[in-house]
Amino acid sequence: EVEKTACPSGKKAREIDESLIFYKKWELEACVDAALLATQMDRVNAIPFTYEQLDVLKHKLDELYPQGYPESVIQHLGYLFLKMSPEDIRKWNVTSLETLKALLEVNKGHEMSPQVATLIDRFVKGRGQLDKDTLDTLTAFYPGYLCSLSPEELSSVPPSSIWAVRPQDLDTCDPRQLDVLYPKARLAFQNMNGSEYFVKIQSFLGGAPTEDLKALSQQNVSMDLATFMKLRTDAVLPLTVAEVQKLLGPHVEGLKAEERHRPVRDWILRQRQDDLDTLGLGLQGGIPNGYLVLDLSMQEALS
């Protein structure tokens, strides 16, 4: 091992204080005791160390805790967290939500970094499930967090946590993710009355099956076009003109503007032109009068 440079006389650090910002890197290495640093980590964030100096401090902690830092140190890492690699973070056992919040605060306003993603993964795995408080915290810092999870990971979200989800948290979710989240939302909001239920479930409807959309059409919900356009095409196709009219209420006239886009386009192709004409919107492309509609899916099932 390379012989370490000795600390100059009178420079041994007795506490972590601002005098250390004037130490050269080798002086920090030689004069700051790692155990002292670990017990006074909360001070590091208040002192404007350079990135090079932070590298030295990190190195000292790595030497002291080769198996990974204890949570008492992790909680006070502050800007030193930005120096950590995903490999460093995988050694940690973070159980406190306060620790998680403290570290997310450091990265606030930035994209989710690999370090943060690893931290969250470690934290959630440690807890066993994505509970409401954790979800609240994560979506507050990263509104798109939920939609970054795989359907398999989302399956560990308990229905009770769905109450923490805001509409914007689902903006980037794809249909596969909404397929997992919708049943949980339905369960979470099941005891609410009609209009309140619709307000809460609306963001999740991209995962709703046909029978649920049919049920909603009987409740005067007045779904807006933006929500309708996010519905699963396979769930919309079996809906009748009357059901869509009831589902959309006054928003039904918006179908004209969307007639070339899915799912409206595909739905129009499945409706009788006669029925579409009753909407008075001039929607074209329905099945002409006198044509027989064969449900091929039913025919396949019978053969």
């Epitope: 420079k11 601002e18 005098s19 004037f22 001070r43 208040a46 002192i47 404007p48």
Partner: antibody, heavy 116, light 110 residues
Framework: EVQLLESGGGLVQPGGSLRLSCAAS????????MSWVRQAPGKGLEWVSG????????YYADSVRGRFTVSRDNSKNTLYLQMNSLRAEDTAVYYC?????????WGQGTLVTVSS | QSVLTQPPSASGTPGQRVTISCTGS????????VSWYQQLPGTAPKLLIY???KRPSGVPDRFSGSKSGTSASLAISGLRSEDEADYYC???????????FGGGTKVTVL
Amino acid sequence: EVQLLESGGGLVQPGGSLRLSCAASGFTFSNYAMSWVRQAPGKGLEWVSGIPPDSASKYYADSVRGRFTVSRDNSKNTLYLQMNSLRAEDTAVYYCAKNMLSFDYWGQGTLVTVSS
Amino acid sequence: QSVLTQPPSASGTPGQRVTISCTGSSSNIGSNAVSWYQQLPGTAPKLLIYYNSKRPSGVPDRFSGSKSGTSASLAISGLRSEDEADYYCGSWDSSLNGYVFGGGTKVTVL
């Protein structure tokens, strides 16, 4: 015990000069940044200048830049403030203080009066 | 006009809790540590709080500091007559490359 003792204050005419000194003891002077802070009669605190341990850079308030010069002699454990082109508005008690980001020890101050 | 803004005065009766605010900007409080100083009449200032919330030894735990964003506050709980003094907040300002103080708050014990 940390002690800071200022000296060199007094009455001076506008346009004149003064040199303040601050003798430090009770800590390793050469490890710490040092500062000068002043307080005009009946007014609040105003930071004047700061100097790191190795004197590599020097920091000044806009109100004194170009007129005041801070320096230190680590072998004598002493901090200095050379004040030139003094104005009436420089009248104040001048304190020397340990550190540059949080002043954990202060001297008792020396009064500088600029008047004709 | 001070770079950091403090209320000019605050008061309370013995035993009460008094809070003093200090508002700055992203270049000072927003990115640097805040300190609080107490100046008793006719004496030199004394450090009360450093690194936002730390108390030097000898400072009673009745004094506490906190920082959030570009603001900081000093709280004095269990107010005593000997707490009657001027209180100043201070922080390094990265834009000015210098230290800045608040205008000071005179605390009166009624």
